[in-house]
């Protein structure tokens, strides 16, 4: 039975040209995290594999940096970066947990962070 929950940074906003950290945290399970995939809609951004390290998709290599931790830093943000981002935790023996983050990239200098929320 999958008992874990994923806590994410929830709905967040950031300024165009700036950077943002996408962060998820898996809790309430003793399952071993083997890999975390970061995806934007249907596109793979990056993978953090417990054994191998990081694989950054070539399409994003100039704008994505690994970390902190299992998180992902998006740099040089554009309005086109607005949308849903998913952290997909591959665990053993539980299986897959998915967290969702919605990022809004703003033209203005007012960019407030949304509250954290949990996905069971």
């Amino acid at each position: 039975m999958m008992t874990g929950t994923i806590e994410t940074t929830g709905n967040i906003s950031a300024e165009k040209g700036g950077s943002i950290i996408l962060q998820c945290h898996l809790s309430s399970t003793t399952a071993q995290v083997t890999q975390v995939n970061w995806e934007q809609q249907d596109q793979l951004l990056a993978i953090c594999n417990a054994d191998l390290g990081w694989h950054i998709s070539p399409s994003f290599k100039d704008r994505v940096a690994p970390g902190p931790g299992l998180g992902l830093t998006l740099q040089s943000l554009t309005v086109n970066d607005t949308g849903e981002y998913f952290c997909i935790y591959h665990t053993y023996p539980d299986g897959t947990y998915t967290g969702r983050i919605f990022l809004e990239v703003l033209e203005s200098s007012v960019a407030e962070h949304g509250a954290r929320f949990q996905i069971p």
Partner: antibody, heavy 127, light 110 residues
């Protein structure tokens, strides 16, 4: 010098078994994923199986799933491929190959490519 | 049949620039790293290009890789007779959880 040396190939009857070995030297074997790739006579390259540095993640091509088993012994710097229920279509030169991986001070990165290859060992399945 | 499609053959004269294409029937090239291998007659494959366009040390800058959408290309400029070989593109296919090679392109230097 980074080197991979395959052994264990030979002639085997259909339905038989064979175990290939790949001895690695010149690099820290336990830090790298490894793969087996084969090439049938006059044909192209076909990836067979891959294994992560610790052996915790293992992948197979559909064509060998359930028949072949990849493993590694990091203390012996050796990669293995146990091949059971062999078929005529398994006839090929089998190469072992080392995955590309680079490390900075803060992170290691992998690229899904293979930068060092052995010279191959021929497996012939025939009655 | 391979998920990655390459022309079976290509040719050029010494000094010429030749391009070999590699197209994907699925989305596996789109966000994945494409690698290129050269296999000279009777020898093991050699890595030419990794991560779309990176050259390992020792590979001449006459070889270059590029990618656009679901297609990748290997360009060889200043073609030489010793470039006559089979060339393979490859990538990791996340849907298959496996590494896939294109069918290979036999390059002939005329």
């Amino acid at each position: 010098e980074v080197q991979l040396l395959e052994s264990g190939g030979g002639l085997v009857q259909p339905g038989g078994s064979l175990r290939l070995s790949c001895a690695a030297s010149g690099f820290t074997f336990s830090n790298y994923a490894m793969s087996w790739v084969r090439q049938a006579p006059g044909k192209g390259l076909e990836w067979v199986s891959g294994i992560s540095p610790s052996g915790s993640s293992i992948y197979y091509a559909d064509s060998v799933q359930g028949r072949f088993t990849i493993s590694r012994d990091n203390s012996k710097n050796t990669l293995y491929l146990q091949m059971n229920s062999l078929r005529a279509e398994d006839t090929a030169v089998y190469y072992c190959a080392k995955a590309i991986r680079t490390c900075s001070l803060s992170h290691c990165y992998y690229y899904y490519g293979m930068d060092v290859w052995g010279q191959g060992t021929l497996v012939t399945v025939s009655s | 049949q391979s998920v990655l499609t390459q022309p079976p053959s290509a040719s050029g004269t010494p000094g010429q620039r030749v391009t070999i294409s590699c197209s994907s029937s699925s989305s596996n090239i789109g966000s994945n790293a494409v690698n290129w291998y050269q296999q000279l007659p009777g020898t093991a494959p050699k890595l030419l290009i990794y991560y779309d366009n990176q050259r390992p040390s020792g590979v001449p800058d006459r070889f270059s890789g590029s990618k656009s959408g679901t297609s990748a290309s290997l360009a060889i400029s200043g073609l030489r007779s010793e470039d006559e070989a089979d060339y393979y593109c490859a990538t990791w296919d996340y849907s298959l959880s496996g590494y896939v090679f294109g069918g290979g392109t036999k390059l002939t230097v005329l």
